[in-house]
């Protein structure tokens, strides 16, 4: 029950996270004009990964997509790539995790297969979240660098007033959405990985052929010991020697001419 809850919660958290990553990627407010020195301005500039916008004091907004691909800063291209990779991995992870959910029955899918799928989707969510966090952080670092550069490039005007030579930009709402969304996706991924441990079968008993004598004498049954890897002991006190012709999981095997010693 706890495993199903952990898996389900991990899925929901990751779903919200990936929706947030998509929202952040599409948002226009990655960087917004810093109004610290100019609180009353006729126009307000803000930019996203795909277009830049200018808003008038009346509320009217005009946006224009970045018409060139080659002329854009390499950092912006890198952030775009990270966010897209994050979305793609997250989407694939969601698809895989739907089939991995314990509460959903698909054919005769074994728990081991569901465990593997849960682990795969968990890893995908973790990488997706890290991509989003990295993308947002790279953009934030770029903003901070530019902000302090434009502050350093201040000059004193004729009236002795300090002026900046370029408009300064600060963190937009998309950055915070991206950080939170990336974090949620990461947490969801970790939860899926934890759930995977509970889904995986604790032990694998391999079927082995039983050998028995024609009389009531004892036959040696190699299947009595679990795979000879040293993993686990015979904790369930199963009989190691058994006169009956049965495999370890008690399925009847019929004697053939090779069975008799």
């Amino acid at each position: 029950m706890a495993v199903t809850a952990c898996q389900g919660l991990g899925f929901v958290v990751s779903l919200i996270g990936i929706a947030g990553i998509i929202a952040a990627t599409c948002m226009d407010q990655w960087s917004t004009q810093d109004l610290y020195n100019n609180p009353v301005t006729a126009v307000f500039n803000y930019q996203g990964l795909w277009r830049s916008c200018v808003r008038e004091s009346s509320g009217f907004t005009e946006c224009r997509g970045y018409f060139t691909l080659l002329g854009l800063p390499a950092m912006l291209q890198a952030v775009r790539a990270l966010m897209i990779v994050g979305i793609v991995l997250g989407a694939i992870g969601l698809l895989v995790s739907i089939f991995a959910l314990k509460c959903i029955r698909i054919g005769s899918m074994e728990d081991s297969a569901k465990a593997n799928m849960t682990l795969t989707s968990g890893i995908m969510f973790i990488v997706s979240g890290l991509c989003a966090i990295a993308g947002v952080s790279v953009f934030a670092n770029m903003l901070v660098t530019n902000f302090w550069m434009s502050t350093a490039n201040m000059y004193t005007g004729m009236g002795g007033m300090v002026q900046t030579v370029q408009t300064r930009y600060t963190f937009g709402a998309a950055l915070f959405v991206g950080w939170v969304a990336g974090g949620l996706t990461l947490i969801g991924g970790v939860m899926m990985c934890i759930a995977c441990r509970g889904l995986a079968p604790e032990e694998t008993n391999y079927k082995a052929v039983s050998y028995h004598a024609s009389g009531h004498s004892v036959a040696y049954k190699p299947g009595g010991f679990k795979a000879s890897t040293g993993f686990g002991s015979n904790t369930k006190n199963k009989k190691i020697y058994d006169g009956g012709a049965r495999t370890e999981d008690e399925v009847q095997s019929y004697p053939s001419k090779h069975d008799y010693v």
């Epitope: 434009s150 370029q166 408009t167």
Partner: nanobody
Framework: QVQLVESGGGLVQAGDSVRLSCAAS????????VAWFRQAPGKEREFVAG????????NYSDSVRGRFTISRDNAKNTVYLQMNSLGPGDTAVYHC????????????????WGQGTQVTVSS
């Protein structure tokens, strides 16, 4: 890359009007926000007016608001600055500037600049 060439400047009387033009070549001007700056002798370059890609949003400095009008004709790849009620304080070299990302009011916001056209207002 876009090249900008200003024209229309000259010597005018105080109170007169003049229209400056800024013709762009090399790229479509509709991909750029454009602005006019001016630089008087011994002074810093100051923002005069700016217009967005389509020209639907405009911005003016307090010193020229109500007297100057910025407009653009993207079909002709040209930006205009209509200057009315000119005074001696408007004497300066007027520069046209373009930037694809923002409509700023600082010189550092613009990547492309014209050589400028001199406007002298005599009293």
């Amino acid at each position: 890359q876009v090249q900008l060439v200003e024209s229309g400047g000259g010597l005018v009387q105080a109170g007169d009007s003049v229209r400056l033009s800024c013709a762009a070549s090399g790229q479509t001007l509709s991909n750029y926000n454009v602005a006019w700056f001016r630089q008087a002798p011994g002074k810093e370059r100051e923002f005069v007016a700016g217009a967005t890609w389509s020209g639907r949003i405009t911005n003016y400095s307090d010193s020229v608001r109500g007297r100057f009008t910025i407009s653009r004709d993207n079909a002709k790849n040209t930006v205009y600055l209509q200057m009315n009620s000119l005074g001696p304080g408007d004497t300066a070299v007027y520069h046209c500037a373009a930037n694809s990302f923002q409509l700023g009011d600082k010189p550092g916001d613009y990547h492309y600049w014209g050589q400028g056209t001199q406007v002298t207002v005599s009293s």
